[in-house]
Interface confidence: medium
Protein backbone atom coordinates (compact mmCIF):
# COMPACT_ATOMS: atom_id res chain seq x y z
CA UNK A 1 0.00 0.00 0.00
CA UNK A 2 1.46 3.34 -1.06
CA UNK A 3 0.71 6.86 0.15
CA UNK A 4 -0.42 9.24 -2.59
CA UNK A 5 1.07 12.74 -2.74
CA UNK A 6 -0.43 15.86 -4.32
CA UNK A 7 1.67 18.91 -5.21
CA UNK A 8 1.05 22.08 -7.19
CA UNK A 9 2.34 21.63 -10.76
CA UNK A 10 4.22 24.92 -10.67
CA UNK A 11 5.20 27.66 -8.23
CA UNK A 12 6.98 30.93 -8.85
CA UNK A 13 9.41 32.23 -6.23
CA UNK A 14 9.25 35.99 -6.76
CA UNK A 15 11.17 37.02 -3.66
CA UNK A 16 13.55 34.06 -3.71
CA UNK A 17 11.18 32.27 -1.33
CA UNK A 18 8.33 29.81 -1.79
CA UNK A 19 5.89 27.65 0.20
CA UNK A 20 5.55 24.17 -1.28
CA UNK A 21 2.72 22.13 0.20
CA UNK A 22 2.83 18.33 0.05
CA UNK A 23 -0.60 16.78 0.63
CA UNK A 24 -0.74 13.11 1.57
CA UNK A 25 -3.46 10.48 1.53
CA UNK A 26 -2.39 9.60 5.08
CA UNK A 27 -2.81 11.14 8.52
CA UNK A 28 0.59 11.89 10.06
CA UNK A 29 -0.75 12.69 13.52
CA UNK A 30 0.76 10.51 16.24
CA UNK A 31 3.05 8.78 13.76
CA UNK A 32 6.81 8.58 13.40
CA UNK A 33 7.54 9.91 9.93
CA UNK A 34 10.17 11.45 7.68
CA UNK A 35 8.95 13.95 5.09
CA UNK A 36 11.49 15.21 2.60
CA UNK A 37 11.75 17.41 -0.47
CA UNK A 38 14.00 16.43 -3.37
CA UNK A 39 15.36 18.46 -6.28
CA UNK A 40 15.80 17.30 -9.86
CA UNK A 41 14.21 14.74 -12.15
CA UNK A 42 16.30 12.05 -10.49
CA UNK A 43 15.58 13.46 -7.00
CA UNK A 44 19.34 13.52 -6.49
CA UNK A 45 19.40 16.44 -4.04
CA UNK A 46 17.60 16.14 -0.70
CA UNK A 47 16.60 19.75 -0.14
CA UNK A 48 14.86 19.60 3.24
CA UNK A 49 13.74 17.05 5.83
CA UNK A 50 10.99 17.21 8.43
CA UNK A 51 11.28 14.39 10.94
CA UNK A 52 8.69 13.74 13.63
CA UNK A 53 8.65 11.10 16.31
CA UNK A 54 7.50 10.67 19.89
CA UNK A 55 10.82 10.92 21.62
CA UNK A 56 12.04 14.32 20.56
CA UNK A 57 10.98 17.66 19.17
CA UNK A 58 10.09 17.96 15.53
CA UNK A 59 13.27 18.29 13.50
CA UNK A 60 13.55 20.38 10.34
CA UNK A 61 16.90 20.47 8.60
CA UNK A 62 18.79 20.61 5.32
CA UNK A 63 22.12 18.89 4.76
CA UNK A 64 22.53 20.48 1.35
CA UNK A 65 22.70 24.15 2.24
CA UNK A 66 19.06 25.12 1.63
CA UNK A 67 17.35 27.55 3.99
CA UNK A 68 14.17 25.68 4.87
CA UNK A 69 11.45 25.39 7.47
CA UNK A 70 8.51 23.02 7.76
CA UNK A 71 4.91 23.26 8.97
CA UNK A 72 2.72 20.25 9.61
CA UNK A 73 -0.95 19.61 9.12
CA UNK A 74 -2.85 16.39 9.75
CA UNK A 75 -2.21 15.17 6.22
CA UNK A 76 0.30 17.66 4.86
CA UNK A 77 3.77 19.11 5.21
CA UNK A 78 4.51 22.57 3.88
CA UNK A 79 8.13 23.32 3.11
CA UNK A 80 9.12 26.98 3.24
CA UNK A 81 12.24 27.61 1.18
CA UNK A 82 14.08 30.93 1.39
CA UNK A 83 17.13 32.50 -0.27
CA UNK A 84 16.64 30.51 -3.46
CA UNK A 85 18.85 31.27 -6.46
CA UNK A 86 17.72 31.58 -10.07
CA UNK A 87 19.83 28.53 -10.97
CA UNK A 88 17.83 26.46 -8.45
CA UNK A 89 14.84 26.59 -10.79
CA UNK A 90 14.01 22.90 -11.14
CA UNK A 91 11.43 20.21 -10.45
CA UNK A 92 10.95 19.33 -6.77
CA UNK A 93 9.41 16.10 -5.44
CA UNK A 94 7.76 15.46 -2.06
CA UNK A 95 8.58 12.19 -0.36
CA UNK A 96 7.06 10.69 2.79
CA UNK A 97 8.06 7.66 4.88
CA UNK A 98 6.11 6.40 7.89
CA UNK A 99 8.27 4.30 10.18
CA UNK A 100 5.88 3.73 13.06
CA UNK A 101 3.47 2.12 13.64
CA UNK A 102 4.13 -0.83 11.31
CA UNK A 103 3.97 -1.49 8.46
CA UNK A 104 6.58 0.83 6.96
CA UNK A 105 4.93 3.01 4.31
CA UNK A 106 6.20 5.35 1.65
CA UNK A 107 4.67 7.19 -1.30
CA UNK A 108 4.08 6.67 -4.97
CA UNK A 109 6.32 9.12 -6.82
CA UNK A 110 4.40 12.32 -7.32
CA UNK A 111 4.29 14.49 -10.45
CA UNK A 112 6.48 17.05 -8.74
CA UNK A 113 6.40 20.84 -8.65
CA UNK A 114 8.39 23.05 -10.95
CA UNK A 115 9.74 25.92 -8.87
CA UNK A 116 10.65 28.87 -11.06
CA UNK A 117 12.94 31.21 -9.16
CA UNK A 118 12.65 34.74 -10.50
CA UNK A 119 15.71 36.88 -9.96
CA UNK A 120 15.45 40.07 -7.96
CA UNK A 121 15.24 42.96 -10.41
CA UNK A 122 16.75 46.13 -9.07
CA UNK A 123 14.87 49.22 -10.18
CA UNK A 124 17.12 51.84 -11.78
CA UNK A 125 17.75 54.87 -9.59
CA UNK A 126 15.64 57.88 -10.55
CA UNK A 127 17.58 60.39 -12.59
CA UNK A 128 17.65 63.87 -11.13
CA UNK A 129 18.65 66.81 -13.25
CA UNK A 130 21.91 68.38 -12.21
CA UNK A 131 22.08 71.80 -10.62
CA UNK A 132 20.84 74.51 -12.94
CA UNK A 133 23.44 76.87 -14.29
CA UNK A 134 22.85 80.60 -14.44
Amino acid sequence: NKILVKQSPMLVAYDNAVNLSCKYSYNLFSREFRASLHKGLDSAVEVCVVYGNYSQQLQVYSKTGFNCDGKLGNESVTFYLQNLYVNQTDIYFCKIEVMYPPPYLDNEKSNGTIIHVKGKHLCPSPLFPGPSKP
Epitope: F29, Q57, L58, L72, G73
Partner: nanobody, 125 residues
Framework: EVQLVESGGGLVQAGGSLRLSCAAS????????IGWFRQAPGKEREGVAC????????YYANSVKGRFTISSDNAKNTVYLQMNSLKPEDTAVYYC??????WGWGMLHMRHGDRGQGTQVTVSS
Protein backbone atom coordinates in the same frame (compact mmCIF):
# COMPACT_ATOMS: atom_id res chain seq x y z
CA GLU B 1 6.59 22.45 38.17
CA VAL B 2 4.38 21.31 35.30
CA GLN B 3 1.00 20.06 36.52
CA LEU B 4 -1.78 18.61 34.37
CA VAL B 5 -5.06 17.46 35.90
CA GLU B 6 -7.65 15.61 33.82
CA SER B 7 -11.34 15.33 34.68
CA GLY B 8 -14.68 14.57 33.04
CA GLY B 9 -14.39 10.85 32.43
CA GLY B 10 -17.13 8.40 33.26
CA LEU B 11 -19.45 5.67 32.04
CA VAL B 12 -21.59 6.44 29.02
CA GLN B 13 -23.67 4.45 26.54
CA ALA B 14 -22.59 4.06 22.94
CA GLY B 15 -23.63 7.11 20.95
CA GLY B 16 -23.38 9.34 24.00
CA SER B 17 -21.07 12.29 24.74
CA LEU B 18 -18.49 13.33 27.33
CA ARG B 19 -16.32 16.40 27.76
CA LEU B 20 -12.86 15.93 29.23
CA SER B 21 -10.92 18.82 30.78
CA CYS B 22 -7.20 19.23 31.25
CA ALA B 23 -6.26 21.97 33.71
CA ALA B 24 -2.64 23.06 33.31
CA SER B 25 -0.30 24.99 35.60
CA UNK B 26 3.41 25.54 36.12
CA UNK B 27 4.26 26.79 32.63
CA UNK B 28 3.36 29.53 30.16
CA UNK B 29 0.19 28.03 28.71
CA UNK B 30 0.16 30.14 25.52
CA UNK B 31 3.59 28.85 24.50
CA UNK B 32 2.65 25.20 24.63
CA UNK B 33 0.68 22.55 22.82
CA ILE B 34 -1.61 20.25 24.81
CA GLY B 35 -2.35 16.79 23.53
CA TRP B 36 -4.66 13.97 24.57
CA PHE B 37 -3.70 10.34 24.25
CA ARG B 38 -5.40 7.20 25.46
CA GLN B 39 -4.43 3.75 26.61
CA ALA B 40 -6.76 0.76 26.71
CA PRO B 41 -5.76 -2.44 28.58
CA GLY B 42 -3.50 -4.60 26.43
CA LYS B 43 -3.40 -2.03 23.64
CA GLU B 44 -0.80 0.43 22.44
CA ARG B 45 -1.11 4.03 23.54
CA GLU B 46 -2.76 6.14 20.85
CA GLY B 47 -2.52 9.86 20.20
CA VAL B 48 -6.03 11.27 20.00
CA ALA B 49 -5.92 15.04 19.47
CA CYS B 50 -3.69 18.03 20.06
CA UNK B 51 -4.05 21.82 20.06
CA UNK B 52 -1.25 24.33 19.70
CA UNK B 53 -2.07 27.22 22.02
CA UNK B 54 0.24 29.61 20.17
CA UNK B 55 -1.68 29.52 16.88
CA UNK B 56 -4.79 27.41 17.57
CA UNK B 57 -3.84 24.62 15.15
CA UNK B 58 -5.62 21.34 15.91
CA TYR B 59 -4.73 17.78 14.99
CA TYR B 60 -6.76 14.57 15.21
CA ALA B 61 -6.23 10.85 14.83
CA ASN B 62 -8.27 9.26 12.05
CA SER B 63 -10.14 7.14 14.59
CA VAL B 64 -11.73 10.21 16.22
CA LYS B 65 -11.87 12.76 13.41
CA GLY B 66 -15.36 14.19 13.02
CA ARG B 67 -16.45 12.90 16.44
CA PHE B 68 -14.01 14.55 18.84
CA THR B 69 -13.22 18.27 19.09
CA ILE B 70 -10.27 19.73 21.00
CA SER B 71 -10.40 23.33 22.16
CA SER B 72 -8.44 25.61 24.43
CA ASP B 73 -9.42 28.30 26.91
CA ASN B 74 -6.23 30.29 27.40
CA ALA B 75 -7.83 32.46 30.10
CA LYS B 76 -8.50 29.37 32.23
CA ASN B 77 -5.34 27.47 31.20
CA THR B 78 -7.60 24.56 30.29
CA VAL B 79 -7.95 22.31 27.26
CA TYR B 80 -11.18 20.46 26.53
CA LEU B 81 -11.86 17.31 24.56
CA GLN B 82 -15.49 17.11 23.47
CA MET B 83 -16.25 13.50 22.61
CA ASN B 84 -19.45 12.80 20.65
CA SER B 85 -20.87 9.63 19.09
CA LEU B 86 -18.80 7.54 21.48
CA LYS B 87 -18.11 3.91 20.60
CA PRO B 88 -17.13 0.95 22.83
CA GLU B 89 -13.67 1.05 21.23
CA ASP B 90 -13.16 4.53 22.72
CA THR B 91 -12.99 2.91 26.17
CA ALA B 92 -9.60 3.76 27.69
CA VAL B 93 -7.78 5.90 30.21
CA TYR B 94 -7.35 9.36 28.68
CA TYR B 95 -4.27 11.40 29.53
CA CYS B 96 -3.28 14.93 28.57
CA UNK B 97 0.31 16.01 28.03
CA UNK B 98 2.07 19.29 27.32
CA UNK B 99 4.91 20.06 24.97
CA UNK B 100 6.13 22.96 22.87
CA UNK B 101 4.66 21.47 19.68
CA UNK B 102 2.01 18.94 18.78
CA TRP B 103 4.64 16.53 17.49
CA GLY B 104 6.80 15.03 20.17
CA TRP B 105 4.40 15.20 23.12
CA GLY B 106 3.50 11.51 23.20
CA MET B 107 6.35 9.38 24.47
CA LEU B 108 8.44 12.30 25.65
CA HIS B 109 5.99 13.02 28.41
CA MET B 110 5.16 9.41 29.14
CA ARG B 111 8.82 9.09 30.15
CA HIS B 112 9.38 12.45 31.81
CA GLY B 113 6.16 12.56 33.75
CA ASP B 114 4.77 15.82 32.36
CA ARG B 115 1.31 14.37 32.02
CA GLY B 116 -1.71 13.90 34.23
CA GLN B 117 -2.89 10.85 36.12
CA GLY B 118 -5.57 10.17 33.54
CA THR B 119 -9.34 9.90 33.54
CA GLN B 120 -11.22 6.69 32.77
CA VAL B 121 -13.73 6.69 29.91
CA THR B 122 -15.95 3.62 29.59
CA VAL B 123 -18.39 3.26 26.72
CA SER B 124 -20.93 0.45 27.10
CA SER B 125 -22.79 -1.10 24.21
Amino acid sequence: EVQLVESGGGLVQAGGSLRLSCAASGFTFDDYAIGWFRQAPGKEREGVACVSNSDGSTYYANSVKGRFTISSDNAKNTVYLQMNSLKPEDTAVYYCAADSRCWGWGMLHMRHGDRGQGTQVTVSS
